[in-house]
C-alpha cells in the first residue's frame, strides 16, 4: 500500500489485544499498530480476526477475508474504550474457539496469533494464559507476543512459541510502529513461486518452493510440502531441505498432461496448511527433451 514490506501468505491471522485499564491513554498507538500491520497482509486467501480482552474476551471481528469487513473491523477497533483487568487467557480462548470451528469444517488453514499486552500477569492469570495459548498451539497455531512497557519477558516467552516469538517494546507505546517491519518479517509465512512450475507428465521431479518464513516452525522437522492435485487429492511430501526462503521438495508424479497441483506448506506435520496461488502444471515432454 505504501511501498513498505508486505506478506502474500494465505493463513488465518488473529490479533489478540489488551484493552485493560492500563492502556487507556495508549489505545490509539495500539490501533495504529494493528492498522498498519493489517494492511501489509495482502493475500486474498488471508483471513483476519480482531479479539480484545480485559476482564472478558470479545471477538470484535470474526474471521474474514472480506476487505470491506476488515475495514469496518478496524473502525470498530478504533472506537474501543479500554478498561478492566488483564485476562489474557480470555483472548486466547476466543482465538482457540474460532480455530476449532474452522478445523471442524474439514480443511485446516494455518493460524498465526499476534497477542499484545502491556503488563505483568499475576501468577494465576499467567497460568491460565499459558494454558490457553497451549490449547491454541494444540489446534495448530503459531503464537507471537508483543510486550509493551511493564511486561514480563519470561512470561511472554512461555505464552509465545519461544523467546524468539516475543517482540519486546521497551520504549513505550509510541515505539510500537518501530517493530512493524520485524513482526511482519517474523510472522509472515508465504509461498511465492515454484521452480520448475511446469513438469513432465509421468516423471519424478524435485521442486524448489520459494517464499519466506519456512524456518519459523517450532520444529523444522515438521515442515511439509503439500500438493493439492486437481482440487481434490492432497499429497504431503517431506522436504529434502528447509531454509527460511526456500524448500526443496520431491514433487508427486502427475501421470497426465494438464494436471494441476496447488502448492501448500504445513509447519506442523499436516495439522494445518498455508495456502498460495502457486500452481504446478504438467506438460508432455518428448523423449530427449
Amino acid at each position: 500500500e505504501d511501498g513498505g514490506p508486505a506478506c502474500y501468505g494465505g493463513f488465518d491471522l488473529y490479533f489478540i489485544l489488551d484493552k485493560s485499564g492500563s492502556v487507556l491513554h495508549h489505545w490509539n498507538e495500539i490501533y495504529y499498530f494493528v492498522e498498519q500491520l493489517a494492511h501489509r497482509f495482502i493475500s486474498p486467501q488471508l483471513r483476519m480476526s480482531f479479539i480484545v480482552f480485559s476482564t472478558r474476551g470479545t471477538t470484535l471481528m470474526k474471521l474474514t477475508e472480506d476487505r470491506e469487513q476488515i475495514r469496518q473491523g478496524l473502525e470498530e477497533l478504533q472506537k474501543v474504550l479500554p478498561g478492566g483487568d488483564t485476562y489474557m487467557h480470555e483472548g486466547f480462548e476466543r482465538a482457540s474457539e474460532q480455530i476449532y470451528y474452522e478445523n471442524s469444517q474439514g480443511y485446516r488453514t494455518a493460524s498465526v496469533i499476534i497477542a499484545l499486552t502491556d503488563g505483568e500477569l499475576h501468577e494465576d492469570l499467567f497460568f491460565y494464559s499459558e494454558r490457553e495459548a497451549n490449547r491454541s498451539r494444540d489446534l495448530g497455531a503459531i503464537v507471537y507476543c508483543v510486550g509493551v512497557k511493564d511486561f514480563n519477558e519470561t512470561q511472554l516467552a512461555r505464552i509465545a512459541d519461544s523467546k524468539d516469538h516475543v517482540f519486546p517494546v521497551n520504549d513505550g507505546f509510541q515505539a510500537l510502529q518501530g517493530i512493524i517491519h520485524s513482526i511482519l518479517k517474523k510472522s509472515c509465512i508465504e509461498i511465492l513461486a515454484a521452480e520448475p512450475s511446469t513438469i513432465c507428465a509421468g516423471e519424478s521431479f524435485q521442486v524448489v518452493v520459494r517464499g519466506n518464513g519456512f524456518r519459523h516452525a517450532r520444529n523444522v522437522d515438521r515442515v511439509l510440502c503439500s500438493f493439492k492435485i486437481n482440487d481434490s487429492v492432497t499429497l504431503n511430501e517431506k522436504p529434502f531441505a528447509v531454509e527460511d526462503t526456500y524448500l526443496l521438495c520431491p514433487a508427486p508424479i502427475l501421470k497426465e498432461v494438464g494436471m494441476k497441483a496447488a502448492l501448500q506448506v504445513s509447519m506442523n506435520d499436516g495439522l494445518s496448511f498455508i495456502s498460495s496461488s502457486v500452481i504446478i502444471t504438467t506438460t508432455h515432454c518428448s523423449d530427449g527433451s
Epitope: K62, E90, E93, Y100, R131, R135, D138, L139
Partner: antibody, heavy 117, light 106 residues
Framework: QVQLKESGPALVKPTQTLTLTCTFS??????????VSWIRQPPGKALEWLAH???????SYSTSLKTRLTISKDTSKNQVVLTMTNMDPVDTATYYC?????????WGQGTLVTVSS | DIELTQPPSVSVAPGQTARISCSGD??????VHWYQQKPGQAPVLVIY???KRPSGIPERFSGSNSGNTATLTISGTQAEDEADYYC?????????FGGGTKLTVL
C-alpha cells in the same frame, strides 16, 4: 461413525457418590483440540453443562458444582468417567455425554439417574 | 459467566418462518450454537459458530448473531420441527446453555 453411550446406576441413594462412564467410538481423545463433556437435564427442565475433559487432559467444571465433580479419561479404553459426590434428590436427571470442544456435535442417548432413599 | 436468555415459547403456522432469540450482553462478540431436542431424545446440533450448518441439517435452518441477540431462523417451518431449542455459548472455560424455547407448530 461417531457414537457415545452413557452407563451407570439408575438409582442412587442421597449422600452417595455417582459414577458414570461414557464409552465412545469413531473418534480419538488423543487427537488435538477436542474432548468430551457431561451435561444433565432434570425432568422437564433445561440442559445444564457439568464438566469437560480435553484431549490434552485439561479439565473444566461448572462453577456451581466444581467441589462435587471429578472428570477423568482412559484414552486406551475410549472412556470418560464422571464422579459426582454427595448426591441429592435435586440431582435426579438424565445425564448425557457429548463430543466437542466449544460446541457439542455428537451426543449419547443419555441415562436417567434417580436419587431417592 | 455470560447469561443466555431465551423466550420460553414460540408458535408458528406450518410453512411460515419461526425466529427464536437468544440474548446476552454483547453476545455478538462471542459464538452461539443451537440444539434441537425432541421429547425423549438427546439434543441434536443444528447450527454452530453463529451460522454454520452441520451436514444433514436441512437448509431451512439458519442462524445469525450481532449486538445483544443471536437468532435461530427456521424458514418454511414443518410439523417435524416442533421441539425444544437451546442456544449455547462458551465463556471462561465453561459451556453455557440458554433456558430453552419450546417451538409449537400450530
Amino acid at each position: 461413525q461417531v457414537q457415545l453411550k452413557e452407563s451407570g446406576p439408575a438409582l442412587v441413594k442421597p449422600t452417595q457418590t455417582l459414577t458414570l462412564t461414557c464409552t465412545f467410538s469413531g473418534f480419538s481423545l488423543s487427537t488435538s483440540g477436542g474432548g468430551v463433556s457431561w451435561i444433565r437435564q432434570p425432568p422437564g427442565k433445561a440442559l445444564e453443562w457439568l464438566a469437560h475433559i480435553y484431549s490434552n487432559d485439561d479439565k473444566s467444571y461448572s462453577t456451581s458444582l466444581k467441589t462435587r465433580l471429578t472428570i477423568s479419561k482412559d484414552t486406551s479404553k475410549n472412556q470418560v468417567v464422571l464422579t459426582m459426590t454427595n448426591m441429592d434428590p435435586v440431582d435426579t436427571a438424565t445425564y448425557y455425554c457429548a463430543r466437542g470442544g466449544y460446541f457439542l456435535d455428537y451426543w449419547g442417548q443419555g441415562t436417567l439417574v434417580t436419587v431417592s432413599s | 459467566d455470560i447469561e443466555l436468555t431465551q423466550p420460553p415459547s414460540v408458535s408458528v403456522a406450518p410453512g411460515q418462518t419461526a425466529r427464536i432469540s437468544c440474548s446476552g450482553d454483547n453476545i455478538g462478540g462471542i459464538y452461539v450454537h443451537w440444539y434441537q431436542q425432541k421429547p425423549g431424545q438427546a439434543p441434536v446440533l443444528v447450527i454452530y459458530a453463529d451460522s454454520k450448518r452441520p451436514s444433514g441439517i436441512p437448509e431451512r435452518f439458519s442462524g445469525s448473531n450481532s449486538g445483544n441477540t443471536a437468532t435461530l431462523t427456521i424458514s418454511g417451518t414443518q410439523a417435524e420441527d416442533e421441539a425444544d431449542y437451546y442456544c449455547q455459548s462458551y465463556d471462561i472455560t465453561s459451556l453455557v446453555f440458554g433456558g430453552g424455547t419450546k417451538l409449537t407448530v400450530l
